[in-house]
């Protein structure tokens, strides 16, 4: 059973995994950021199902690409260089979901744009830390 | 039909530097990411970097970061690439391409004929 | 950066005949997302520019013939040339597209027995 320390530690992760996803979805919607238009062009994956901390697999495989996507946005719109971002939240995604477990993600059919990526996984974080209080 | 046609063959001395240029016709040079690539028959292909010609965005391979600076200038639907402090390692041809589709950053798709640049003395 | 090695570094054929040309990468180019591997294979004859023949490791680029096909998944892909043609002599490139730097095999010199 997790004791109070661990699901404080997971719950801290999840806050620190919520505010990296929310410092990128600002940068991106920043009414100076010329490149939206360009970004939401780009295609990424959901997951069927994301209620789970093993869900985290799904965005842990579409961090890769979300790399890509963010090496588009003037850097000045985010604080770290998008390899430092993605690796902060690749460390994160690691530690949350656990290497233990081989959990096999399965897709939804339909495509994201990078706002509704974005907003998926900041709606799972919101979700499990509000369980986890 | 989309065409990049670049500019010709260029003589240059170890340490000068030089500019070569790319320009887009068929579609709208800010649509797309141009990428430029490196040829020497010895060392095959490598990639330099890309530009984004709507704001001038540019991402270089680490190798390339001192040596290519790449711009754009929307208004003659064209990109430039300026090689600096030019050694013999240099001479090579060098292609502009563009990305196929903007629903990723690659692959190439579209290829200018190429620039062959020789440094010698 | 993924490294790509390609394999053979020439390659002596006839015409008519089948030819195999490999590519490994050190990480898998599989985007589980859509199940596409973004890997892709050039041709580059002597005094040309590259020319895209294969993207995503099996889908032909319009207007390639389809003697070239490309497959494979992962970390280890092939290109398969059936029916060699003259004009097929070149070199050819594989090309991981994934991840910034893109990065190119080797190169493979395709030549006449």
């Known amino acids: 059973a997790p004791t109070s320390s661990s699901t404080k530690k997971t719950q801290l992760q999840l806050e620190h995994l919520l505010l990296d996803l929310q410092m990128i979805l600002n940068g991106i919607n920043n009414y100076k950021n010329p490149k939206l238009t360009r970004m939401l062009t780009f295609k990424f994956y959901m997951p069927k199902k994301a209620t789970e901390l093993k869900h985290l697999q799904c965005l842990e495989e579409e961090l890769k690409p979300l790399e890509e996507v963010l090496n588009l946005a003037q850097s000045k719109n985010f604080h770290l260089r998008p390899r430092d971002l993605i690796s902060n939240i690749n460390v994160i995604v690691l530690e949350l979901k656990g290497s233990e477990t081989t959990f096999m993600c399965e897709y939804a059919d339909e495509t994201a744009t990078i706002v509704e990526f974005l907003n998926r996984w900041i709606t799972f974080c919101q979700s499990i830390i509000s369980t986890l209080t | 039909e989309i065409q990049l046609q670049q500019s010709g063959p260029e003589l240059r001395r170890p340490g000068s530097s030089v500019k070569l240029s790319c320009k887009a016709s068929g579609y709208n040079i800010t649509d797309y990411l141009i990428h430029w690539v490196r040829h020497r028959p010895e060392h095959g292909l490598e990639w330099i970097g890309w530009i984004d010609p709507e704001d001038g965005e540019t991402r270089y391979a680490q190798k390339f970061q001192s040596k290519a600076t790449l711009t754009a200038d929307t208004s003659s639907n064209a990109a430039y690439m300026q090689l600096s402090s030019l050694t013999p390692e240099d001479t090579a041809t060098y292609f502009c391409a563009r990305q196929l589709d903007s629903t990723y950053i690659y692959p190439f798709a579209y290829w200018g004929q190429g620039t062959l640049v020789t440094v010698s003395s | 950066d993924i490294v790509m090695t390609q394999s053979p570094f020439s390659l002596a054929v006839s015409e008519g005949e089948m030819v195999t040309i490999n590519c490994k990468s050190s990480q898998s180019l599989l985007r589980s997302g859509n199940q596409k591997n973004y890997l892709a294979w050039y041709q580059q004859k002597p005094g040309q520019s590259p020319k895209l023949l294969i993207y995503?490791?099996?889908t032909g680029q319009s207007g390639v013939p389809d003697r070239f096909i490309g497959s494979g998944s992962g970390t280890d892909f092939t290109l398969t040339i059936s029916d060699v043609q003259a004009e097929d002599l070149a070199d050819y490139y594989c090309?991981?597209?994934?991840?910034?730097?893109?990065?190119f095999g080797a190169g493979t010199k395709l030549e006449l027995k």
């Open positions: 995503y490791a099996s």
């Open positions: 090309l991981q597209h994934y991840i910034t730097p893109p990065t």
